[in-house]
């Protein structure tokens, strides 16, 4: 259903959105899988303190998603 609230991004997904342009720009020949692998390595080496802003934003988006989905269901729309 195009009107359904969009799936919420994880903290890691938000991080990937930040750094994917650099990885792809510096390594244009990398496959999608290799780009994802590199981003995973970067995320794993990111300090917990610096993961926090991404986690906070993901939590806020989750909160909004839950409100939106509740409102969407209240309208009588199917899952």
């Amino acid at each position: 259903d195009p009107n359904a609230p969009k799936r919420l991004p994880s903290a890691f997904f938000l991080f990937c959105s930040e750094y994917r342009p650099k990885i792809k720009g510096e390594h244009p020949g990398l496959s999608i899988g290799d780009v994802a692998k590199k981003l995973g390595e970067m995320w794993n080496n990111t300090a917990a303190d610096d993961k926090q802003p991404y986690e906070k934003k993901a939590a806020k988006l989750k909160e909004k998603y839950e409100k939106d989905i509740a409102a969407y269901r209240a309208k009588g729309k199917p899952d």
């Epitope: 938000l14 959105s17 930040e18 750094y19 342009p21 650099k22 720009g25 510096e26 390595e41 970067m42 080496n45 990111t46 300090a47 917990a48 303190d49 610096d50 802003p53 991404y54 934003k57």
Partner: antibody
Framework: EVQLLESGGGLVQPGGSLRLSCAAS????????MLWVRQAPGKGLEWVSY????????NYADSVKGRFTISRDNSKNTLYLQMNSLRAEDTAVYYC?????????????WGQGTLVTVSS | DIQMTQSPDTLSLSPGERATLSCRAS???????LAWYQQKPGQAPRLLIY???TRATGIPDRFSGSVSGTEFTLTISSLQPDDFATYYC????????FGQGTKLEIK
């Protein structure tokens, strides 16, 4: 060649404000996280603040949280640090630095710094 | 917070000698996120080593880094006049913490 050039430092009274800028050139600015690091006269290095490539994510050292704001304008290749409620202990040379990753994170390029003096 | 303690505070050596600078972390640190910087008076710091042991671009091979547990070591095999400066280690496991620095001076 990567270049980072800070400006905006100067003498300011306690409680005052200042806005530092860091003009970047020689690389794709929007790909990189950027940071501010400071060094009080005769002292060591202290991390101040971090901003992600898009500017959507930031972090601050406890000593400046709530007083300093980091931002960036990727269309102008410029990093900023808005400093409010300045204290004597904020007196330092402020460096902007590029944060990079290659099997680990590190600062690979630094500007020459701009001196901020907080004094009455 | 992780504390980085460098030793000695000051090291007095002559050109041609070997310098060994130590940096100890108060708790476990990911060695991938450990870097060394050189700073000369009135200048910005310069990256020497990242990932505890990888030399940055353009850094001569007389500089090397190693790790043993929570102790990180920067070694300069044969000191050149240009090497006399202050050296900082920096960890990135919990925010960004620098050591207090080791000043390498001419004896």
């Amino acid at each position: 060649e990567v270049q980072l050039l800070e400006s905006g430092g100067g003498l300011v009274q306690p409680g005052g404000s200042l806005r530092l800028s860091c003009a970047a050139s020689g690389f794709t600015f929007s790909w990189y996280s950027m940071l501010w690091v400071r060094q009080a006269p005769g002292k060591g290095l202290e991390w101040v603040s971090y901003i992600s490539p898009s500017g959507g994510f930031t972090n601050y050292a406890d000593s400046v949280k709530g007083r300093f704001t980091i931002s960036r304008d990727n269309s102008k290749n410029t990093l900023y640090l808005q400093m409010n409620s300045l204290r004597a202990e904020d007196t330092a040379v402020y460096y902007c630095a590029r944060w990079d990753y290659n099997s680990g994170w590190y600062y690979d390029h630094w500007g020459q710094g701009t001196l901020v003096t907080v004094s009455s | 917070d992780i504390q980085m303690t460098q030793s000695p505070d000051t090291l007095s050596l002559s050109p041609g000698e070997r310098a060994t600078l130590s940096c100890r972390a108060s708790q476990s640190v990911n060695s991938r996120n450990l870097a060394w910087y050189q700073q000369k008076p009135g200048q910005a710091p310069r990256l020497l080593i990242y990932g505890a042991s990888t030399r940055a671009t353009g850094i001569p091979d007389r500089f090397s880094g190693s790790v043993s547990g929570t102790e990180f070591t920067l070694t300069i095999s044969s000191l050149q006049p240009d090497d006399f400066a202050t050296y900082y280690c920096q960890q990135y496991n919990s925010y960004f913490t620098f050591g207090q620095g080791t000043k390498l001076e001419i004896k």
